[in-house]
């Protein structure tokens, strides 16, 4: 089931998927002056079995200078809405990402790929947020969002990250910084679609994330 909307935006923050759930689609977009090859795929699809997931189809771009046709626009699969885009920079990923069952890792770039990637997320997808450079987390509650299905409709959970540019915030004295505990959240406020194993693995990944994995920014 595709998610109807884009993941929520957080002021002065970017989000990133660490891995993509099976069923996720990535549009085959080419940079200006290039187009998809004639018989090329419209999108890549994350598919797999119980032990291994990978991207089906390959995106291929060719120079459009050889054709004197009108400007070609990449069609979207019929009933799908456009997903959030991401600027392609370094597709560096944490090594443990591949071990997440039922998920694909970030697809490697293809030749003459567009500068932005358009993903079509599915229910159960999780994305992680981080404050942009020059801002810091005033409050770091759950800094992720999950696409979940409620009452037959999809919705992304609201991340509880507040990024501030103000460096002079006051902290009350004599208080140790507590550890936020994601496992303490009531069921009604988490997605029933994300298994404990998924959540723990992804939380551990999020906890060990280095800034470098956020180099592929979502606009």
């Amino acid at each position: 089931e595709l998610c109807d909307d884009d993941p929520p935006e957080i002021p002065h923050a970017t989000f990133k998927a660490m891995a993509y759930k099976e069923g996720t689609m990535l549009n085959c977009e080419c940079k200006r002056g290039f187009r998809r090859i004639k018989s090329g795929s419209l999108y890549m699809l994350c598919t797999g079995n119980s032990s291994h997931s990978s991207w089906d189809n390959q995106c291929q771009c060719t120079s459009s200078a050889t054709r004197n046709t009108t400007k070609q626009v990449t069609p979207q699969p019929e009933e799908q809405k456009e997903r959030k885009t991401t600027e392609m920079q370094s597709p560096m990923q944490p090594v443990d990402q591949a071990s997440l069952p039922g998920h694909c890792r970030e697809p490697p770039p293809w030749e003459n790929e567009a500068t932005e990637r358009i993903y079509h997320f599915v229910v159960g997808q999780m994305v992680y947020y981080q404050c942009v450079q020059g801002y810091r987390a005033l409050h770091r509650g759950p800094a992720e969002s999950v696409c979940k299905m409620t009452h037959g409709k999809t919705r992304w959970t609201q991340p509880q990250l507040i990024c501030t540019g103000e460096m002079e915030t006051s902290q009350f004295p004599g208080e140790e910084k507590p550890q936020a505990s994601p496992e303490g959240r009531p069921e009604s406020e988490t997605s029933c679609l994300v298994t404990t194993t998924d959540f723990q693995i992804q939380t551990e990944m999020a906890a060990t994330m280095e800034t470098s994995i956020f180099t592929t920014e979502y606009q």
Epitope: E9, H139, G141, Q158, Q160, T169, Q171, P178, P186, E189
Partner: antibody
Amino acid sequence: QVQLVQSGAEVKKPGASLKISCKGSGYTFTDYAMHWVRQAPGQGLEWIGVISTYSGDAIYAQKFQGRATMTVDTSTSTAYLELSSLRSEDTAVYYCARGVTFDYWGQGTTVTVSS
Amino acid sequence: DIQMTQSPSSLSASVGDRVTITCRASQDISNYLEWYQQKPGKAPKLLVYNAKTLAEGVPSRFSGSGSGTDFTLTISSLQPEDFGTYYCQHHYDTPYTFGQGTKLEIK
């Protein structure tokens, strides 16, 4: 279910200080920042500030800087707002509200400042 | 600070009417906008967040739209229980400011 329960009404004299509380239940307290908002009689809503229940960091609206102090006690899942040097213009209903989108609010604490 | 301006400041409408309240920000706030409903003597209640997402439990007759500086809250078919004052508020940056409110009365 999620609840924010605030302390009872207060009557104070000008120049005095005030401390009101907001106890959260039904969710993990440190997951959500806490905002304080006030509403003078017949007036609109005014944002006082926000505190991270996780770190204790706080940001105040300029108007309340130096006179308002927000704190939290994570052991009791309670947020506090202290307001010093009270004046009659501070007469208002004070609310706590949870999270980025203020999705749950306390019932309000009526504060009357009068000589 | 970002100023939020609501219009109208008050309006009277009949049950079944389509009602629209607008909110304008003094600068671009993307979609970082919430709408609240407040009834006399009660705390505000979240209706819409991130400009267009309906809060849980809010009837589908309420909808939000807009982005940048101009936003709209629409009640498609006014119900008697919809009376009260409606506020918009941004969460783009601190201080998070509210609109002055729109008082909605049922004719």
